[in-house]
């Protein structure tokens, strides 16, 4: 058993021309939240049920309004990691798909108040207990920028998970660095120590001693791009020349890319560019349709009629939403200002406010600067309900009331020595410097290479 | 003391649109959600939709959807409710209502109510 | 969505009376319930919130109780002025409801 852990860095405009209008605008403010599909393997006709491996919902985003005329930012994200627990043995290989969602505040009950920005796919080889894998994707004019990784839950161990150790309270007889695993007392497992030098991002490996390459990575330490390592012989006597005499089978040789994308080739790899409808790495994962399970909270897939739409969700009560994933109740309205939380009781509803907020909807930013004053002449400065001393010069801590050290943070240059001095600090500088702070040399001639004005 | 005062009856030929105005005094305005109730001829009441004056977020009956949007204006404490397509069926009295915002009152006060009437 | 039904919608009665009209939801509504009053070419007014509280300047002779799904409005000695339509409404959850009313007639 273990997780699946998924790190959303930054959803925006990708690169390039035809950047995308922000999805919120003033007059209809968002947020986002992101869903993410597992299915075991890297074959093409998987069979398995949808989301297989599971599935995992993020926590909705702060609400962002686009400020008019200015450029579609990254988007304000979630807190927190999307974790998608497993029960069985982790797969080393699989298939991911990441949804981007906005929540449309302000939207009719039973209307489109949820829909699909974009929709990435991959498939990808990961051992569990390795360090996080980065990754980019693309979908349309969006780019999604992520980390994931797979760890095991304890007791289980192994690239796999599918080992499992356990503390021993005899004595341990195995050596330091090894622990004892179960079933086998007498066995001791050493932790998993890849062959040297193995790249710790592009490499990985489920033997020790080996070195097993992530997608679009080779070479004997996963260290070279596949697009680099296509030459079968080099063009002339040195190996360091590059260039190919024989071309070697390209990335993009026998298209890798499905319903009609076209293929490119990239410094690290291939880009498939996909058909309108079409997403993933290799154009593989098609619109929306019941089999990938857009419904929530056991909302029933309908599919539609037409393309364009792919599918229906009808609703269980208390569900609303074009994916019933929107629970419309009392706390929608939003209530509680600066953000405070909303709590339903019942008979009415109240508000739980944020540190520096008080009222009954959370409405007065608490002065935390009256009544309490900074020290050594420090001034207090107010904003976002907190108060934070700006402290003279000297001192530091909340209240000013620590003695700052000057000479912490080693601003004296060139081997100079820092002296703390009532007034800040100064340096003693070493023979051939000077200068406030010993930035500046000075040459034999007495002349200093002070910049020129 | 509190008051809802709206815009008068409204004579409208089908297709067009109208907008009904309710103006509030005498108490902080962002502080209550706007309800707004439809009354056919004859008939009993219909809750439309209710808006959040501080924030703007709405919501709406899932039988008021799409011609019919509600609105604030913060500076002159007024709710709006715009009809556009305007329809025979759409003749009613229609009321603004407020509400407090953490829902420990119900529809306290009510406005005199604004006769749309929609005619070929 | 959550239906409001209402009963008798009609009544005779004379003043001086008790009068007593209930209302039941299609499913509990925790007290998140109110009763209106509205006359000829009026708007409505509110009488009672939460079941059982009543809104400032409402005469003590109208009460209201209930809890889970079913709810009473009553006016323990109808006067001329109570004669006109009364009407439930749930804000337990969205969209909020209303009764199909009782008209109080004079009889």
């Known amino acids: 058993a273990g997780v699946f852990e998924l790190q959303i860095h930054s959803f925006g405009p990708g690169p390039g021309p035809g950047a995308p209008r922000s999805p919120c605008s003033a007059r209809l403010p968002c947020r986002l939240f992101f869903r993410v599909c597992l299915k075991p393997g890297l074959s093409e006709e998987a069979a398995e049920s949808p989301c297989a491996l599971g599935a995992a919902l993020s926590a909705r985003g702060p609400v962002y309004t686009e400020q008019p005329g200015a450029p579609a930012p990254d988007l304000p994200l979630p807190d927190g990691l999307l974790q998608v627990p497993f029960r069985d043995a982790w797969p080393g290989t699989f298939s991911f798909i990441i949804e981007t969602w906005r929540e449309e505040l302000g939207d009719q009950i039973g209307g489109p108040a949820w829909s699909l920005l974009a929709r990435v796919a991959g498939r990808r080889r990961l051992a569990a207990g390795g360090p996080w894998a980065r990754d980019i994707q693309r979908a349309g004019a969006w780019e999604l920028r992520f980390s994931y990784r797979a760890r095991c839950e304890p007791p289980a161990v192994g690239t796999a998970c599918t080992r499992l150790c356990r503390p021993r309270s005899a004595p341990s007889r195995c050596g330091p660095g090894l622990r004892p695993c179960a079933p086998l007392e007498d066995e001791c497992e050493a932790p998993l120590v890849c062959r040297a030098g193995c790249s710790p991002e592009h490499g990985f490996c489920e033997q020790p001693g080996e070195c097993r390459c992530l997608e679009g990575w080779t070479g004997p330490l996963c260290t070279v791009p596949v697009s680099t390592s296509s030459c079968l012989s080099p063009r002339g006597p040195s190996s360091a020349t590059t260039g190919c005499l024989v071309p070697g089978p390209g990335p993009c040789d026998g298209n890798p890319c499905a319903n009609g994308g076209s293929c490119s080739e990239t410094p690290r790899s291939f880009e498939c560019t996909c058909p309108r409808g079409f997403y993933g790495l290799r154009c593989e994962v098609s619109g929306v349709t019941c089999a990938d399970g857009p419904c929530f909270n056991g909302g029933l897939c309908v599919g539609g009629a037409d393309p364009d739409s792919a599918y229906i969700c009808h609703c269980p009560p208390g569900f609303q939403g074009s994916n019933c994933e929107k629970r419309v109740d009392r706390c929608s309205l939003q209530p509680c200002r600066n953000g405070g939380l909303c709590l339903d009781l019942g008979h009415a509803l109240r508000c739980r406010c944020r540190a520096g907020f008080a009222g009954p909807r959370c409405e007065h930013d608490l002065d935390d600067c009256a009544g309490r004053a900074c020290a050594n002449g420090g001034t207090c400065v107010e904003g976002g309900g907190a108060h934070r001393c700006s402290c003279a010069l000297g001192f530091g801590g909340r209240d000013c009331r620590e003695r700052a050290d000057p000479c912490a943070a080693r601003p004296c240059a060139h081997g100079g020595r820092c002296y703390a001095h009532f007034s800040g600090l100064v340096c003693a500088c070493a023979p051939g410097y000077m200068g406030a702070r010993c930035e500046f040399p000075v040459h034999p001639d007495g002349a200093s290479a002070l910049p020129a004005a | 003391e509190v008051q809802l005062v709206q815009s008068g009856s409204e004579l409208k030929k089908p297709g067009a649109s109208v907008k009904v105005s309710c103006k509030a005094s005498g108490y902080t305005f962002t502080d209550y959600y706007m309800n707004w109730v439809r009354q056919a001829p004859g008939q009993g009441l219909e809750w439309m939709g209710i808006i959040n004056p501080y924030s703007g977020v709405t919501i709406y009956n899932h039988k008021f959807k799409g011609r019919f949007v509600l609105s604030v204006d913060k500076s002159s404490n007024t709710a709006y409710l715009q009809i556009s397509s305007l329809k025979a069926e759409d003749t009613a009295v229609y009321y603004c209502?407020?509400?407090?915002?953490?829902?420990?009152?119900?529809?306290?006060?009510w406005g005199q109510g604004t006769t749309v009437t929609v005619s070929s | 969505d959550i239906q409001m039904t209402q009963s008798p919608s009609s009544l005779s009665a004379s003043v001086g009376d008790r009068v007593t009209i209930t209302c039941h939801a299609s499913q509990g509504i925790s007290g998140n319930m109110g009763w209106l009053q509205q006359k000829p070419g009026k708007a409505p007014k509110g009488l009672i919130y939460h079941g059982a509280n009543l809104e400032d300047g409402v005469p003590s002779r109208f009460s209201g109780s209930g809890s889970g799904a079913d709810y009473t409005l009553t006016i323990s000695s109808l006067q001329p002025e109570d004669f006109a339509d009364y009407y439930c409404v749930q804000y337990a959850q969205f969209p909020y409801t209303f009764g199909g009313g009782t008209k109080v007639e004079i009889k």
């Open positions: 209502a407020r509400q407090d915002s953490l829902l420990d009152y119900a529809m306290d006060y």
